[in-house]
């Protein structure tokens, strides 16, 4: 499945296998979390809509030295059609709201699970 139930995005939409792998990685992060994820680092909240893969990457790329999310950062970069670097922001960021990385990951996970279901049951 290369189209996920009405989900519009500039650039590539991950096929179900790639999306599934990303979700599995986020599940692993949330389940294996013992100490505060990334030492409680804060990131910009994002709108979980079109283009959110790039927005998520733009937010998470500003967290450095956190091995727990490195694989997620790499996976998201594969879903984003343009190169993302630290300090870059898109209109999808809720610029007045910062949340902990752990909450960001949970929110992203819930949304991606929903997208995965929509892609399966279309």
């Amino acid at each position: 499945l290369t189209c996920l139930g009405g989900f519009a995005s500039p650039g590539p939409v991950p096929p179900s296998t790639a999306l599934r792998e990303l979700i599995e990685e986020l599940v692993n992060i949330t389940q294996n979390q013992k100490a505060p994820l990334c030492n409680g680092s804060m990131v910009w909240s994002i709108n979980l809509t079109a283009g959110m893969y790039c927005a998520a990457l733009e937010s998470l790329i500003n967290v450095s030295g956190c091995s727990a999310i490195e694989k997620t950062q790499r996976m998201l970069s594969g879903f984003c059609p343009h190169k993302v670097s630290a300090g870059q922001f898109s209109s999808l960021h809720v610029r007045d709201t910062k949340i902990e990385v752990a909450q960001f990951v949970k929110d992203l996970l819930l949304h991606l699970k929903k997208l995965f279901r929509e892609g399966q049951f279309n």
Epitope: G5, T17, K113, R117, E118, Q120, F121, N122
Partner: antibody, heavy 120, light 107 residues
Framework: QVQLQQSGAELVRPGASVTLSCKAS????????MHWVKQTPVHGLEWIGG????????ASNQKFKGKAILTADKSSSTAYMELRSLTSEDSAVYYC?????FGGGPFAYWGQGTLVTVSA | DIKMTQSPSSMYASLGERVTITCKAS??????LSWFQQKPGKSPKTLIY???RLVDGVPSRFSGSGSGQDYSLTISSLDYEDMGIYYC?????????FGGGTKLEIK
């Protein structure tokens, strides 16, 4: 805890239709996909199809296309399966089953089953 | 459709014995496999998902392993309450398909 409560046994005439229900409780109904499974002594367990209760989107086993119609009512947290043009081949126990694909699997929780007997 | 071949179809084992049931998929299913136990007149009960993850509340004597096309369910020390029929299920792609079942009886 998660519970799936299915409707009672049905005795139906050949050619008729029947609608089975599955009421979910103990979780947010729209968070998990819902599937239906047929069990007979001859064919064992067979996946009929599934539904995303949030969108109403469905996926079906080609073998049951036109036979089973799946719907879900968010307001009552209930999934339905209508079986049409029944024949003796449709006599079976039907289960609803749900779960988180990524945590427990899509068939983590099962209803108690509904026995459907097709007989003149 | 992905065919799931389960073996043996039936077996007898003694209490305390180590029991292994296998399931072979007709193609790679990426470890998207569940194991279920069913007792007469009851609904199936999920034991394992994602090939090797134990469901909460399931005794630790049950374990799952495998990858690619080959998977197995092992009961490390058979208990009287373990008798029943065991099924595998692939949920890698639609249509989801079950194995034919393994009837486990106590010797």
């Amino acid at each position: 805890q998660v519970q799936l409560q299915q409707s009672g046994a049905e005795l139906v005439r050949p050619g008729a239709s029947v609608t089975l229900s599955c009421k979910a409780s103990g979780y947010t109904f729209t968070d998990y996909e819902m599937h239906w499974v047929k069990q007979t002594p001859v064919h064992g367990l067979e996946w009929i199809g599934g539904i995303d209760p949030e969108t109403g989107g469905t996926a079906s086993n080609q073998k049951f296309k036109g036979k089973a119609i799946l719907t879900a009512d968010k307001s009552s947290s209930t999934a339905y399966m209508e079986l049409r043009s029944l024949t003796s081949e449709d006599s079976a126990v039907y289960y609803c089953t749900s779960g988180d694909y990524f945590g427990g699997g899509p068939f983590a929780y099962w209803g108690q089953g509904t026995l459907v007997t097709v007989s003149a | 459709d992905i065919k799931m071949t389960q073996s043996p179809s039936s077996m007898y084992a003694s209490l305390g014995e180590r029991v292994t049931i296998t399931c072979k998929a007709s193609q790679d299913i990426n470890s998207y496999l569940s194991w279920f136990q069913q007792k007469p007149g009851k609904s199936p009960k999920t034991l394992i998902y994602r090939a090797n993850r134990l469901v909460d509340g399931v005794p630790s004597r049950f374990s799952g392993s495998g990858s690619g096309q080959d998977y197995s369910l092992t009961i490390s020390s058979l208990d009287y309450e373990d008798m029943g029929i065991y099924y595998c299920l692939q949920y890698d792609e639609f249509p989801y398909t079950f194995g034919g079942g393994t009837k486990l009886e106590i010797k």
